[in-house]
Amino acid sequence: GSVPPMVNVTRSEASEGNITVTCRASSFYPRNITLTWRQDGVSLSHDTQQWGDVLPDGNGTYQTWVATRICQGEEQRFTCYMEHSGNHSTHPVPSGNSHHHHHHHH
């Protein structure tokens, strides 16, 4: 069977006026997954995103991440889109530097 990913979005200061947003998917099986940043619902071009490898996380499941740099104040336009085993979800950028919840998707 399949195990849906936990998806977590974080933000960190990058440089003046910019922030780096990172979307992490973990504890999923099988390893095939789509994880991408969208702006206004449109996928960002590949050259503006950085992807991590899909790696085993030691529990028979997998983890990966995608990051991009965006302008501070434009966070509302961006979402992380995940597709896995026929299911999908959309994840907003959290405001400020608050704690972030992991979202498990079925």
Epitope: G41, V42, R77, T79, H88, S89, T90
Partner: antibody, heavy 118, light 108 residues
């Protein structure tokens, strides 16, 4: 086949409200944003706003923020545009469209003509 | 707001001729955010070219797009009868999303 089917033409009095529906099919409704655009007779295209059906986030063109309301009903996979305090200048064809993988508007509804006349 | 100015407003050409349509932006746009749409009378717009130069599904190879910064071009190498329509450029780089006012390609 991806399609977006809109509700029929409407005639409204100035000051009234109108609600236009858009029912997409052929893809997972919550996987793509729904955009709304209008086109006055003989004029160009004007973006009104969009809604992300999965998380319910709405982004408006500031020009329409006070009068436009975008909603979705996930149970029926339908998106709605409501425009209030109608005036004659709101006479236009209103389109819904789907956000694409690489462009803002990749599939369009057939359009709904809204006529505002006393 | 980024204003897109299309020129000419109307282009009168014969079938078989080459059409060159321009779209000029009031501020620089990344080429990833410039798209073109075609609209025929009584029909909805149709995505033609995305991200400056990529043909949308089903679009004939006689259409091409180019440009960068503030200046973008849509070219139809040899006009077919079904190409006579209005063409709009659109930017998705900054809010509000905006369209050009359109260029009408009509039969001469």
């Amino acid at each position: 086949e991806i399609q977006l089917v809109q509700s029929g033409a409407e005639v409204k009095k100035p000051g009234a409200s109108v609600k236009v529906s858009c029912k997409p099919s052929g893809y997972a409704f919550t996987s793509n944003n729904i955009y709304w655009v209008r086109q006055a007779p003989g004029q160009g295209l004007e973006w009104i706003g969009y809604i992300d059906p999965y998380i319910g986030r709405i982004i408006y063109n500031q020009q329409f923020k006070d009068r436009a309301t975008l909603t979705v009903d996930k149970s029926t996979s339908t998106a709605y545009l409501e425009l209030s305090s109608l005036r004659s200048e709101d006479t236009a064809v209103y389109y819904c469209s789907r956000s694409g993988e690489r462009s803002n508007f990749d599939y369009w509804g057939q359009g709904t003509l809204v006529t505002v006349s006393s | 707001e980024i204003v897109l100015t299309q020129s000419p407003a109307t282009l009168s050409l014969s079938p078989g001729e080459r059409a060159t349509l321009s779209c000029s932006a009031s501020s620089s746009i990344s080429s990833n955010y410039l798209h073109w749409y075609q609209q025929k009378p009584g029909q909805s717009p149709r995505l033609l070219i995305y991200r400056t130069s990529n043909l949308a599904s089903g679009v004939p190879a006689r259409f091409s797009g180019s440009g960068s910064g503030t200046d973008y071009t849509l070219t139809i190498s040899s006009l077919e009868p079904e190409d006579f329509a209005v063409y709009y450029c659109q930017q998705g780089g900054s809010l509000p999303l905006t369209f050009g006012q359109g260029t009408k390609v009509e039969i001469k």
